[in-house]
Amino acid sequence: QPPPPPPDATCHQVRSFFQRLQPGLKWVPETPVPGSDLQVCLPKGPTCCSRKMEEKYQLTARLNMEQLLQSASMELKFLIIQNAAVFQEAFEIVVRHAKNYTNAMFKNNYPSLTPQAFEFVGEFFTDVSLYILGSDINVDDMVNELFDSLFPVIYTQLMNPGLPDSALDINECLRGARRDLKVFGNFPKLIMTQVSKSLQVTRIFLQALNLGIEVINTTDHLKFSKDCGRMLTRMWYCSYCQGLMMVKPCGGYCNVVMQGCMAGVVEIDKYWREYILSLEELVNGMYRIYDMENVLLGLFSTIHDSIQYVQKNAGKLTTTIGKLCAHSQQRQYR
Amino acid sequence: SAYYPEDLFIDKKVLKVAHVEHEETLSSRRRELIQKLKSFISFYSALPGYICSHSPVAENDTLCWNGQELVERYSQKAARNGMKNQFNLHELKMKGPEPVVSQIIDKLKHINQLLRTMSMPKGRVLDKNLDEEGFESGDCGDDEDECIGGSGDGMIKVKNQLRFLAELAYDLDVDDAPGNSQQATPKDNEISTFHN
């Protein structure tokens, strides 16, 4: 092992290295000094480091560490950020197509229900989008609102087209009758089940991806402790004080230091593993009624069938509703 | 039967239902993401080793620095923390994670709980229950064609519904990502403030 530089040697090489970190040479001694004020790079003999240099080395070491951490997570961060954005947009595209399919079904099969049907369908799918993005909306309420809104228009336009333009009082009665008489059969319940399950899973999937980004961002921007900074300085820079510029830290020593510095971060590992495995389980289960693409793009067909169900039972329903909402209708005719 | 709005929106660029095999769907995209994520399953436990391998460490040199002195790479002194009197490495480990790390661990625990709840078969109303409602047709197999919608002639089959890559503005291949390959990152000159 080479002895420390003799006291008469200059610190010229150390100065030129340090200048890259800190322009201005006033902190580097001309010749090696005892270094009794040093706190991290404790010298065994004369040293080319000063207290100010040591502080700068600590700052640089912590900065290096932060940069290394960020470069380590770059690929993972990019993967999750880009996927979160792509899936969010893909889900929006599905919602848009589902809305267009449903509007097309109304336009082609029930033109007399438009444009109001477009309005109710539009509001429904707006709520679907908001729910996926985390809004506090109840899916069952959304579906109920869709059918509650559709029924008065179906009743006044398809089943009883002789009625004058629907007024609020008969509409309210018809909305109530829709649920009481189960005019759409079990279709609303079927849609509720399928939509709520597929949207719940979709929402959690997006939430999980966004949390993944948050996890990486958190560990990406960790500020390392002073103790860690001292350990890193000793590992990366203290050799400079002895004029050993080209020497590198020992591998085993580096691992010990890194484990010390990153003890807190490594605690995430267990939960991170579980996160990826749980996400995999969720993804494996995203099919049929748990797949929003499948459910939403088929909604137009189920809604069509539900209207056919109403039409099939129109005779019976008109009689019952005629009695049930008679008071509202009389008020409307006056 | 329900008019199927397949060719209604050609001018509106609505994606038509795809009848071509092997087209990319959302579900295949999700599975692809999981496969890529699984390659990062040990990300946090491997971090200390990764950082050492991407910062200047002695690999081919005979001598290396142990924090206090120059030693032979394979000597016992090489792995020892040179400044053992300065402060205790064990103490540093015992401090526990920072508050921000504790917070993120709590959030991970919560999402993991949610994910598990959603994935649990017993937590689900399975398709079987819907069959009892009498709305699903019996001729719907478990092949890649999915049953959509209600009964009778309103039923349509949709194969590999949407091709999202065609419509999304950006490609998802991480191969083009900046700094994507952990292996290829240059070690010694990666961080500008290292001067070795």
């Epitope: 947009e89 848009r96 477009f118 309005e119 539009g122 989008s129 333009d165 509409n171 | 509106k12 660029k13």
Partner: antibody
Framework: EVQLVESGGGLVQPGGSLRLSCAAS????????MNWVRQAPGKGLEWVSY????????KYADSVKGRFTISRDNAKNSLFLQMNSLRDEDTAVYYC????????????WGQGTMVTVSS | EIVLTQSPATLSLSPGERATLSCRAS??????LAWYQQKPGQAPRLLIY???NRATGIPARFSGSGSGTDFTLTISSLEPEDFAVYYC?????????FGQGTKVEIK
């Protein structure tokens, strides 16, 4: 001809009230969602409020919430905006606009009515 | 709320020239984007809906494109009556918001 005609604008003091009306013709008013959109002098467009055809959904911009009330009378083909606690920054041309859900756009606009809030 | 940023603020062109107006959303709006034209003292008029579809009666020289966060309105060959202010508007999320406008003026 599809038409929307606003009325009721004028000069009012800060803290005062005003009621705007919009008369619709040429389409089935009771089937469409309606909105108020405003434009301050020399500035851009700002959505103010939305009401569904059956009045079951009503939405407001944060800037007017609690001060403005949107309503409609389908029997009279009319849309209203009751504006209370008016502020200087409410000075604008107020447009009545039909929302077409199939297009996801404001497809029909009135010519606007000027509201000036000044002491 | 989603912020729409239009650029440029002013576009000085001559009749017959091609005008390209840009609208950028602060987050994805899918294709829920419309374009309006407004002339001095007049109400806005719908030009394009769903990012790329021309409204009834709008000449073919007007075209829209884009999806997600970046959208473009193109007027292939400016006519004298096209000099006006153009606004983009999103409906992906409530509230519906408008861009600050791009003024297309005669050079």
């Amino acid at each position: 001809e599809v038409q929307l005609v606003e009325s009721g604008g004028g000069l009012v003091q800060p803290g005062g009230s005003l009621r705007l009306s919009c008369a619709a013709s040429g389409f089935t008013f009771s089937s469409y969602s309606m909105n108020w959109v405003r434009q301050a002098p020399g500035k851009g467009l700002e959505w103010v409020s939305y009401i569904r055809s059956d009045s079951r959904t009503i939405k407001y911009a944060d800037s007017v919430k609690g001060r403005f009330t949107i309503s409609r009378d389908n029997a009279k083909n009319s849309l209203f905006l009751q504006m209370n606690s008016l502020r200087d920054e409410d000075t604008a041309v107020y447009y009545c606009a039909r929302w077409e859900w199939e297009l996801d756009a404001f497809d029909i606009w009135g010519q606007g009515t000027m509201v000036t809030v000044s002491s | 709320e989603i912020v729409l940023t239009q650029s440029p603020a002013t576009l000085s062109l001559s009749p017959g020239e091609r005008a390209t107006l840009s609208c950028r959303a602060s987050q994805s709006v899918s294709s829920y984007l419309a374009w309006y034209q407004q002339k001095p003292g007049q109400a806005p008029r719908l030009l394009i809906y769903d990012a790329s579809n021309r409204a009834t009666g709008i000449p073919a020289r007007f075209s829209g494109s884009g999806s997600g966060t970046d959208f473009t309105l193109t007027i292939s060959s400016l006519e004298p009556e096209d000099f006006a202010v153009y606004y983009c508007q999103q409906r992906s999320n409530w509230p519906p918001t408008f861009g600050q406008g791009t003024k297309v003026e005669i050079k």
